[in-house]
């Protein structure tokens, strides 16, 4: 499975349960770890800080004791545990620490982790709320007229809305420049699509739409294979084909259509 | 202590400069103000720090106009690039200089960087299909105002179009829909008081012509190791190939 670096992590939990938020800051010798919550339309606010040397949480005034707890499974690793969740706990949680930078100054800047989105909901969802892909291949018109082709990767019926999509050529770890629409709500789930336009010379390469989502099967990135295409116009018989997914061997069916 | 960012959002074309205002209230005499950039992925990136007893801070394209008496600390981003589109937060730091200090944030200002003002460009329009799904791809147009209409007699559902800035500094758009009669769906686009149809771009070929998957080591005949498809594969016409994974 491929690795989508940084950003966009989510945790979905029902009310009255607990949640764990892992800090992804790689800091050695941090004396204090701060936890911030950012809710849409509000200013980010600190909830507490963790005194590393004394293994002690110091909460902001007005917060209920026992709600937050910093767990350290190993050295320089921190997990915020939230108990007795309510819907209003939803938001983006950041860990942060002061980076001294220049020793001459008493501090320089506060570094933030990449953030984890917590979604607290009691909605009854389908058992499988992983992104369901549909692929679109370039139109003949585009490849002929523009000497380029656009692949489109549609992802539907996923929850929560936190998703990350990128594109790579087969046998390459280079992330290709793609474009995407906003994540859209459809009933109780979400949909999103991403597209990649490649020059004619790249149309004979296999491309992968790689999707990171909390509910992907086995917790690994989903790889949707876009087969290489010939841009010369030819006639073909319908065939069944196989292609590899990151998790599965899937059947790709090619369909011949006549007028 | 309080931080106020009155601008909820601002838009500016590339190459220009944008100034983001931030007012704060504090009883401290000595303090620091920080500016952060929040990416769409929610990552929070430090940009620049302004000390209350320091000259106006400058770092690359970021500069701060600090007025201590007015308790104002404006961030200017010069020579804007498309990648500068993000939410920008102003934050006031406790004066203690201790590792326990917290930041007091404003609500943030969303910056949208637009393409440079330029001559109008007419879009190219292409239709892509898979089963009941139809996508209308509208490429390389300017200005942004556009109406995309998927023409069908049997609509199941349609989605709002995604309009994004293209790598070349114009706009691209995609509109998706689901239709019972996807084979007959066409796309028409209204832009700059003109109508452009996907049929204007169609290549006149035989109905059996295809954009065909190239045969590679990864596209082989099915064997017993192949799992059944996760979704039904329907036929379609324009890209002459339907793949549902």
């Amino acid at each position: 499975s491929s690795n989508l670096e940084g950003g966009t992590k989510s945790v979905t939990r029902p009310t009255r349960s607990s949640a764990e938020i892992t800090c992804d800051l790689t800091v050695i010798n941090a004396f204090y770890i701060h936890w911030y919550l950012h809710q849409e339309g509000k200013a980010p606010q600190r909830l507490l800080y963790y005194d590393v040397s004394n293994s002690k949480d110091v909460l902001e005034s007005g917060l209920s004791p026992g709600k937050y707890y910093t767990h350290t499974p190993r050295r320089w690793s921190w997990i915020l545990i939230l108990r007795n969740l309510i819907e209003n706990d939803s938001g983006v949680y950041y860990c942060a620490t002061w980076d001294r930078g220049n020793p001459k100054t008493h501090y320089y800047k506060k570094l933030f982790g990449s953030g984890t989105t917590l979604v607290v909901t009691d909605k009854q969802l389908d058992a499988d709320v992983s992104p369901k892909p549909t692929i679109f291949l370039p139109s003949i018109a585009e490849t002929k007229l523009q000497k380029a082709g656009t692949y489109l990767c549609l992802l539907e019926k996923f929850f929560p809305d936190v998703i990350k999509i990128h594109w790579q050529e087969k046998k390459s770890n280079t992330i290709l420049g793609s474009q995407e629409g906003n994540t859209m709500k459809t009933n109780d789930t979400y949909m999103k699509f991403s597209w990649l336009t490649v020059p004619e010379k790249s149309l004979d390469k296999e491309h992968r739409c790689i999707v990171r989502h909390e509910n992907n099967k086995n917790g690994v990135d989903q790889e949707i294979i876009f087969p290489p295409i010939k841009t010369d116009v030819i006639t073909m018989d319908p065939k069944d084909n196989c292609s590899k997914d990151a998790n599965d061997t899937l059947l790709l069916q090619l369909t011949n259509t006549s007028a | 202590q309080k931080v106020t960012q009155a601008q909820s959002s601002v838009s500016m074309p590339v190459r220009k400069a944008v100034t983001l205002n931030c007012l704060y209230e504090t009883s401290w005499w000595s303090y620091y103000i920080f500016w952060y950039k929040q990416l769409p992925s929610k990552e929070m990136i430090f940009l620049i720090r302004q000390g209350s007893d320091e000259q106006n801070a400058k770092s690359g394209r970021y500069s701060v106009n600090f007025k201590k008496a007015a308790k104002s600390v404006a961030l200017t981003i010069s020579a804007l690039q498309l990648e500068d589109s993000a939410k920008y937060f102003c934050a006031l730091g406790d004066p203690g200089g201790l590792n326990t200090d917290k930041l007091i944030f404003g609500k943030g200002t969303r910056v949208t960087v637009e393409p440079r003002s330029q001559p109008h460009t007419k879009p190219s329009v292409f239709v892509m299909k898979n089963g009941t799904n139809v996508a209308c791809l509208v490429k390389e147009f300017y200005p942004k105002d556009i109406r995309i209409n998927l023409v069908s007699s049997k609509k199941i559902t349609e989605f709002d179009p995604a309009i994004v800035i293209s790598p070349s500094g114009k706009y691209n758009a995609v509109k998706l829909g689901k239709y019972e009669d996807s084979n007959s769906v066409t796309c028409s686009v209204q832009h700059d008081n003109k109508t452009v149809h996907s049929t204007d771009f169609e290549v006149k070929t035989d109905s059996t012509d295809h954009v065909k998957p190239k045969e590679t080591e990864n596209t082989k005949q099915p064997s017993k190791s192949c799992h059944k498809p996760k979704a039904i594969v329907h036929t379609e016409k324009v890209n002459m190939m339907s793949l549902t994974v």
Epitope: - | V14, R15, A79, T121, K122
Partner: antibody, heavy 121, light 112 residues
Framework: QVQLQQPGADLVRPGTSVKLSCKAS????????MHWVQQRPGQGLEWIGV????????NYNQKFKGKATLTVDTSSSTAYMQLSSLTSEDSAVYYC??????????????WGQGTTLTVSA | DVVMTQTPLTLSVTVGQPASISCKSS???????????LNWLLQRPGQSPKLLIY???KVESGVPDRFSGSGSGTDFTLKISRVEAEDLGLYYC?????????FGAGTKLELK
């Protein structure tokens, strides 16, 4: 004063490529767009494309896509146009012309003297 | 592409007399930003083109005030109030509202 200097003439063989230059002086090179215009013998003017030296943003006339490639070297304040797979049809005078930002009017207020390109075996 | 149609193709005038050249575009040159991007250029024999007028009616600095431009939408006119010998040459209209930028075929101004 503002000047756009172009070599007077160039003679090249069919099938080869040529890189025409346009050296700017007397103004801030990155503050103006640079356009290229073709004028065939006894004919009118035809716009080839434009480049913004500040970030190398380009836009081409579809007719010249694949034929012309625009680049800049900001260190020497020079704009270049490479023409490939040359044929006798490409024999023409090629002008560079600068324009202000689009919001300011985008008018071609300064022109080079033009390079006469002859493609001949 | 936007087609720019200039009339007449040749204009024979006497020095001191007025002259008028018309330029019609195949579609409106009004940009979404509210400006109309129509330029007039003069190319004297053996020289490169020179800007006379931009944004329909703005006269470029250094250009004599006997030159004026008018029009809107698709119809534009260049007027010379009193032609002088130095005004001879090819006059081009140029639209920069739509990509690709397009020139008129040119109007040759000659002395009677």
């Amino acid at each position: 004063q503002v000047q756009l200097q172009q070599p007077g003439a160039d003679l090249v063989r069919p099938g080869t490529s040529v890189k025409l230059s346009c050296k700017a002086s007397g103004y801030t090179f990155t503050s103006y767009w640079m356009h290229w215009v073709q004028q065939r013998p006894g004919q009118g003017l035809e716009w080839i494309g434009v480049i913004d030296p500040s970030d190398s943003y380009t836009n081409y006339n579809q007719k010249f896509k694949g034929k012309a490639t625009l680049t800049v070297d900001t260190s020497s304040s020079t704009a270049y146009m490479q023409l490939s797979s040359l044929t006798s049809e490409d024999s023409a005078v090629y002008y560079c012309a600068r324009s202000d930002d689009y919001d300011e009017g985008y008018f071609f207020d300064q022109w080079g003297q033009g390079t006469t390109l002859t493609v001949s075996a | 592409d936007v087609v720019m149609t200039q009339t007449p193709l040749t204009l024979s005038v006497t020095v001191g007399q007025p002259a008028s050249i018309s330029c019609k575009s195949s579609q409106s040159l009004l940009h979404s930003n509210g400006k109309t991007y129509l330029n007039w250029l003069l190319q004297r024999p053996g020289q490169s083109p020179k800007l006379l007028i931009y944004l329909v009616s703005k006269v470029e600095s250094g250009v004599p005030d006997r030159f004026s431009g008018s029009g809107s939408g698709t119809d534009f006119t260049l007027k010379i109030s009193r032609v002088e010998a130095e005004d001879l040459g090819l006059y081009y209209c140029l639209q920069v509202t739509h990509f690709p930028l397009t020139f008129g075929a040119g109007t040759k101004l000659e002395l009677k």
